[in-house]
């Protein structure tokens, strides 16, 4: 049982490599987490699977001053075909529903692993 979504290829880097690197970064974050990630900041949740890279970035970009996720933010921007800035609100988000950054990252890792297993690189 899987759920899949597609994304834009991040330039010249093979999509499978880019996705694997993003997964590895999220694994590092979840495994090295000691104190609450980003001081327990909350971000918008997401209610769909399509277009989730831009939606994920739109959520995480609103977290500032958190060095632990800066690389993730940069990597996600490579998967999103349009420019994302803080304060944007996508229809993919669940309005009035926020979750902890740590849970968001954990769930993003779960979803990306599914995509990778199914070969959904573009």
């Amino acid at each position: 049982l899987t759920c899949l979504g597609g994304f834009a290829s991040p330039g010249p880097v093979p999509p499978s490599t880019a996705l694997r690197e993003l997964i590895e970064e999220l694994v590092n974050i979840t495994q090295n987490q000691k104190a609450p990630l980003c001081n327990g900041s909350m971000v918008w949740s997401i209610n769909l699977t399509a277009g989730m890279y831009c939606a994920a970035l739109e959520s995480l970009i609103n977290v500032s001053g958190c060095s632990a996720i800066e690389k993730t933010q940069r990597m996600l921007s490579g998967f999103c075909p349009h420019k994302v800035s803080a304060g944007q609100f996508s229809s993919l988000h669940v309005r009035d529903t926020k979750i902890e950054v740590a849970q968001f990252v954990k769930d993003l890792l779960l979803h990306l692993k599914k995509l990778f297993r199914e070969g959904q690189f573009n």
Partner: nanobody, 118 residues
Framework: GVQLLESGGGLVQPGGSLRLSCAAS????????MGWARQAPGKGLEWVSI????????YYADSVKGRFTISRDNSKNTLYLQMNSLRAEDTAVYYC???????????WGQGTLVTVSS
């Protein structure tokens, strides 16, 4: 934190119907395979039905095939179980849960009691 809250259980006569709901919060519901499990009095826990994240693929235990229907509304972060043609042997506590193989993604609700009796 993560919360799964079941509702809709109760007493119903054999042949009757019930619709269970599970309200999810604290995690990205849309990215999880979800399911319903049940535990009858004095018995072990068994999976009743599982539904994939997008709602396309479903699994049903043989004992409920053709009678139960699982569904989800990702926009409402809610999981459902429509139970028709209920039998005495369906009496159990029904649990809403994530259905992921990955370690660390195991979340369960507190359960809702379904009693089928005349």
């Amino acid at each position: 934190g993560v919360q799964l809250l079941e509702s809709g259980g109760g007493l119903v006569q054999p042949g009757g119907s019930l619709r269970l709901s599970c309200a999810a919060s604290g995690f990205i519901f849309a990215w999880y395979d979800m399911g319903w499990a049940r535990q009858a009095p004095g018995k072990g826990l068994e999976w009743v039905s599982i539904i994939a994240c997008k709602g396309g693929k479903t699994y049903y235990a043989d004992s409920v095939k053709g009678r139960f229907t699982i569904s989800r509304d990702n926009s409402k972060n809610t999981l459902y179980l429509q139970m028709n043609s209920l039998r005495a042997e369906d009496t159990a506590v029904y649990y809403c849960a994530t259905a992921e193989d990955e370690p660390g993604y195991d979340y369960w609700g507190q359960g809702t009691l379904v009693t089928v009796s005349s």
